[in-house]
Each structure stands twice: as structure tokens, then as C-alpha cells.
């Protein structure tokens, strides 16, 4: 009589997560009598996956009815495969005994699980930065297998090249994670910009997953300030305007100072948005010229997004105002439209207009 052989015809089987895996095994002889067991791995730490003789294996079904007469097909089907099921499975024949004795093993079938990557999550910097600064965005995706994966970055549809990507772990694993960090240089026009992290994997059938982040969460566009005086009104009041333009985000507090004393404080809210996503705001201050003997120094003080205040001063020349309606106004603008912001890298940027 021929010696029993245990045949596992496939060296490897690849299955998508959530599907069933069929692991084939046949014996070449009915002799000796004894059950088949399936193990994952070898040696003392091997894991029992299915035993024909005893045990409860809710996810495992024999392909062929074990009670079928003269059965020599010991293939099994494992349902609802997850990445944790990856490994090499061995079909092992036992000889009937007390206890049954291991007789012969098949060569093993390596089960690899194709698992989709999770939706990429893109996170931006913890603090906002201004134009010309470089900020980092991180993209993470987890739980995929096999390890091969492609990640690309885009800004407004244009592919980025300044990024670094790692896939972990480096060695064999049931599933893998990817983490990529891209460096993006901000411009004043980036309020409406978007960065996209695109992940391509064999499980996605050519339809990559995308994660996005809005640069609006990462950027701060400081305001321009301009203070101007309108015509003298009939009631000896001068209308002084502070125009705050091209700023983002909207969080802004404006304070009027008359000769260094706080006159009024306002908070920006519900402003219309410019095409580029920035905001403009205009504040007026009425100065009663007849109430002043000397020139009035008006200061428009703007605190934007928690940054140090920016001042723009303007002197109203009281002596230049005749006390009748409709006369020309004379004013001297002594302010310097200066914004002084301290950024993460401790550089100072001065803008003069």
C-alpha cells in the first residue's frame, strides 16, 4: 500500500478582508484511520484552526462533509477573513490512538489578506502661520495589506514633491500603516486652498482614497490698515475711517484711541467674504472738533487673531477747522501703516505702505 501523503496544492492564497478563504488539502490514502487538524504556524506555539475530531470552530467549515464515506478531502473554508488571519496554514493528519498521534503534515499554504487602507486623515499645524512660511501637513492611513502602497500629495490639484513617507512596520505584519508629512509654503492667496493626500492600493481597484485639509485652518493673513478723514460735517464733527483689509481669519478686535485714551472697542462679526476668502472691515469714528482745543491724535488699534496689536495713528488738526459748515478739512496723517508680527521662527516682518 502507498504511503499516505498530505497534499496542500496551493503554496499561497490571497483573500480580501471580509471574504472567505478556502484552504485545500487532500490525503492520498484512507490509511491510517485518524482525523485531520489544521494549524496556523509550526512548533509548540502553533494555533489550532480546525479539528475534525473535536472543538468548536464557528468560522471554519469543512468543504467536504467529514462523514462522507471514504472522505479524503480535508479542505476547509474560513469565513469573514481579517488581516489577523494571515499566516501559513498546515493540514496535519493524525493516526487514531489514545491520544491520536500526529503522522504527517502538508507543506503549508500561506494565507495573505488584502485589506483596504482606512480613509486617509490629514492633519495640519497646531498654530497658524503667515504667508511665505512653510507648514507641515500629516497624512495617516492604517490597516492595509499587502505592504505596497502609493501616497501622493496635491495642493489645489498640483502634485507636491516636498514630503516624506514611512510605512510601518518595516518587517512582516498582518497589516500596515502609512504616515506622510508634506511641507507647504503658504501664500496670501491660500485661504481657499486645499491639500489632498491620495492613497493608492491594490485593494482599491484603481480608485484611490483621498483625505483633505483646508489651508484656511493653517493660515493667518494679517490685515492692512488705512486711516482717512472724511469731510467736515455741519455739526463740527469729523468722520475718521479705519479700513482694515485683506485679513483672515475673521477674529479681529478694533479699538479707537483719542489721545491715547480708549474711545470705543469693536469686534468683527458676520463680515462678507472677499473672493480670495479674506475679509475687509471699516470702522468710523466721529470726532467733535469744537470740543477740542488742541489737535486730536486718533489711533486705530487692531488686534487680529490673538496676535500683538497693530496701530495706525492720525492727527486731526483742530486749528485748521473753521467753525462753519462745508469748509475744507486739513489733516495730517502721522501714522505709519506698520504691522509687526512675531512668527514661530522669531523673524520680524515690517510692511510699509
Amino acid at each position: 500500500e502507498e504511503e499516505l501523503q498530505v497534499i496542500q496544492p496551493e503554496k499561497s492564497v490571497s483573500v480580501a478582508a471580509g471574504e472567505s478563504a478556502t484552504l485545500n488539502c487532500t490525503a492520498t490514502s484512507l490509511i491510517p484511520v485518524g482525523p485531520i487538524q489544521w494549524f496556523r504556524g509550526v512548533g509548540p506555539g502553533r494555533e489550532l484552526i480546525y479539528s475534525q475530531k473535536e472543538g468548536h470552530f464557528p468560522r471554519v467549515t469543512p468543504v467536504s462533509d467529514p462523514t462522507k464515506r471514504n472522505n479524503m478531502d480535508f479542505s476547509i473554508r474560513i469565513s469573514n477573513i481579517t488581516p489577523a488571519d494571515a499566516g501559513t496554514y498546515y493540514c496535519v493528519k493524525f493516526r487514531k490512538g489514545s491520544p491520536d498521534v500526529e503522522l504527517k503534515s502538508g507543506a503549508g499554504t500561506e494565507l495573505s489578506v488584502r485589506a483596504k487602507p482606512s480613509a486617509p486623515v490629514v492633519s495640519g499645524p497646531a498654530v497658524r502661520a503667515t504667508a511665505e512660511h512653510t507648514v507641515s501637513f500629516t497624512c495617516e492611513s492604517h490597516g492595509f495589506s499587502p505592504r505596497d502602497i502609493t501616497l501622493k500629495w496635491f495642493k489645489n490639484g498640483n502634485e507636491l514633491s516636498d514630503f516624506q513617507t514611512n510605512v510601518d512596520p518595516a518587517g512582516k505584519s498582518v497589516s500596515y500603516s502609512i504616515r506622510s508629512t508634506a511641507r507647504v509654503v503658504l501664500t496670501r492667496r491660500d485661504v481657499h486652498s486645499q491639500v489632498i493626500c491620495e492613497v493608492a492600493h491594490v485593494t482599491l481597484q484603481g480608485d484611490p482614497l483621498r483625505g483633505t485639509a483646508n489651508l484656511s485652518e493653517a493660515i493667518r493673513v494679517p490685515p492692512f490698515l488705512e486711516v482717512t478723514q472724511q469731510s467736515m460735517r455741519a455739526d463740527n464733527q469729523v468722520n475718521v475711517t479705519c479700513q482694515v483689509t485683506k485679513f483672515y481669519p475673521q477674529r479681529l478686535q478694533l479699538t479707537w484711541l483719542e489721545n491715547g485714551n480708549v474711545s470705543r472697542t469693536e469686534m468683527a462679526s458676520a463680515l462678507p467674504e472677499n473672493k480670495d476668502g479674506t475679509y475687509n472691515w471699516t470702522s468710523w469714528l466721529l470726532v467733535n472738533v469744537s470740543a477740542h482745543r488742541d489737535d486730536v491724535k486718533l489711533t486705530c488699534q487692531v488686534e487680529h487673531d490673538g496676535q500683538p496689536a497693530v496701530n495706525k495713528s492720525f492727527s486731526v488738526k483742530v486749528s485748521a477747522h473753521p467753525k462753519e459748515q462745508g469748509s475744507n478739512t486739513a489733516a495730517e496723517n502721522t501714522g505709519t501703516n506698520e504691522r509687526d508680527y512675531k512668527d514661530d521662527d522669531d523673524k520680524h516682518h515690517h510692511h510699509h505702505h
Epitope: 500500500e1 484512507l30 490509511i31 484511520v33 485518524g34 482525523p35 479539528s51 475534525q52 475530531k53 473535536e54 472543538g55 462533509d65 467529514p66 462523514t67 462522507k68 464515506r69 471514504n70 472522505n71 487514531k96
Partner: antibody, heavy 119, light 110 residues
Framework: QVQLVQSGAEVKKPGASVKVSCKAS????????INWVRQAPGQGLEWIAM????????HYNQIFKDRATLTTDTSTSTAYMELRSLRSDDTAVYYC????????????WGRGTLVTVSS | DIVLTQSPDSLAVSLGERATINCRAS??????????IFWYQQKPGQPPKLLIY???NLDSGVPDRFSGSGSGTDFTLTISSLQAEDVAVYYC????????FGQGTKLEIK
């Protein structure tokens, strides 16, 4: 370790029925056939029938087809053999036996249940 | 049905001697290269015990003084050197179709 534990001895009147049980342990009950065999006093072995507990497929010896019924309760891993219309020549030891190799053989046996049919 | 006929009905053999029991089937019990004959030993007051399966394969724990041979319709159980504990009734059984047993052979010590 495979064990088949049978119910105790029974004394029955002619025309009555008897139901013998066989509780299995030490293996997956639904993966192996259970055979029933009887042996009259001083006589040889006589195969009655067999059942597949996984789907209750049965095969009967023609001699017993009309009088014997095999059933199983998979929740308790117990096989049953009911014999109806008992006659005095049904007096015998009734064995259950498990087929470990799906060869229609009898690898492991219960200790037997003596059924005595007497008026 | 396949009928199995054992011979002899009884047999007395001296300790240490060879004992041979025959089993003849009314038609072939061979299929796909296997001979579907099984041998059992039954001692008084005990259930039968499987000795040989598929004509020539020793079951687990059975001493190797027992052996089985034959094919087709004629089969033999041999005990090469009889021991006192071998006194029993021996049955052949086939499973080529639904099972049947031979009538049994009683083995005693001479």
C-alpha cells in the same frame, strides 16, 4: 478520549417499544457516524442501522427498517435507537458504536444495553 | 446483501502457536484499491474491539502478533503466537455495501 455511555437495562413486554440512548463525548458528535449493533444471548453480532448526526441521514438493515428508528440530539451529543413491536427474540444487548474513519466500520463501542422482552 | 462466512466456527490452538481464521464474502468487497473488511475481537461480557481495518491495517494499540490479509472475497486473520488473553470470539465485517458481520469464530486454547 472518545466515550459512548449507554442507558441502563430495560425489561419490556412483547408489543411494547424501547428507546436506548447513547451519549457521546471526547469528540465532535456531528462529524462521525453512529452505528447500532445487537447481540442476542450466545449469538453473533447483527448490524441494525447507522446515522449521521450532522444531517440525520440514516441507513437501515432491511430486517429492521420497519421497526427501528434512529435519532440524535446534537445539543446533548446523544444518539437514540427506538425499536417498536418488540418480540421475545429481540432480547439482546444493544450496542452503539462510532465510525472514526468514515469507512462504515465500528472503532469505538458503548458498553451495551441489555433489553429483555418477556411477558 | 453480501454474506460473510467465517471458518472454522471454533478453533483450539496451543499457546505460542499460530491461529488462522478465514472470512469469505459472497462477492468482492474490494473498491478503489481498498478491501473493505474489518476484524473484531470480543471477550466475554465486553463489547467488540476493532483489530484490523481495510483487511490488513492494524488498529491503534493492537499487538503486532495480529495481522490481516486477503483481497476480493477471501480474507484471513492471523495470530502469529497465541497468548492466553487472545481467547475470544472473532468477527469479520464488511462495508463494501451496508455492513454485515460474519457469524463469528470462537478461539480457545488447546
Amino acid at each position: 478520549q472518545v466515550q459512548l455511555v449507554q442507558s441502563g437495562a430495560e425489561v419490556k413486554k412483547p408489543g411494547a417499544s424501547v428507546k436506548v440512548s447513547c451519549k457521546a463525548s471526547g469528540y465532535t458528535f456531528t462529524n462521525y457516524w453512529i452505528n447500532w449493533v445487537r447481540q442476542a444471548p450466545g449469538q453473533g453480532l447483527e448490524w441494525i442501522a447507522m446515522i449521521d448526526p450532522s444531517d440525520s441521514e440514516t441507513h437501515y438493515n432491511q430486517i429492521f427498517k420497519d421497526r427501528a428508528t434512529l435519532t440524535t440530539d446534537t445539543s446533548t451529543s446523544t444518539a437514540y435507537m427506538e425499536l417498536r413491536s418488540l418480540r421475545s427474540d429481540d432480547t439482546a444487548v444493544y450496542y452503539c458504536a462510532m465510525d472514526y474513519g468514515s469507512l462504515y466500520a465500528m472503532d469505538y463501542w458503548g458498553r451495551g444495553t441489555l433489553v429483555t422482552v418477556s411477558s | 446483501d453480501i454474506v460473510l462466512t467465517q471458518s472454522p466456527d471454533s478453533l483450539a490452538v496451543s499457546l505460542g502457536e499460530r491461529a488462522t481464521i478465514n472470512c469469505r464474502a459472497s462477492k468482492s468487497v474490494s473498491s478503489s484499491g481498498y478491501n473493505y473488511i474489518f476484524w473484531y475481537q470480543q471477550k466475554p461480557g465486553q463489547p467488540p474491539k476493532l483489530l484490523i481495518y481495510l483487511a490488513s491495517n492494524l488498529d491503534s494499540g493492537v499487538p503486532d502478533r495480529f495481522s490481516g490479509s486477503g483481497s476480493g472475497t477471501d480474507f484471513t486473520l492471523t495470530i502469529s503466537s497465541l497468548q492466553a488473553e487472545d481467547v475470544a470470539v472473532y468477527y469479520c465485517q464488511h462495508s463494501r455495501e451496508l455492513p454485515t458481520f460474519g457469524q463469528g469464530t470462537k478461539l480457545e486454547i488447546k
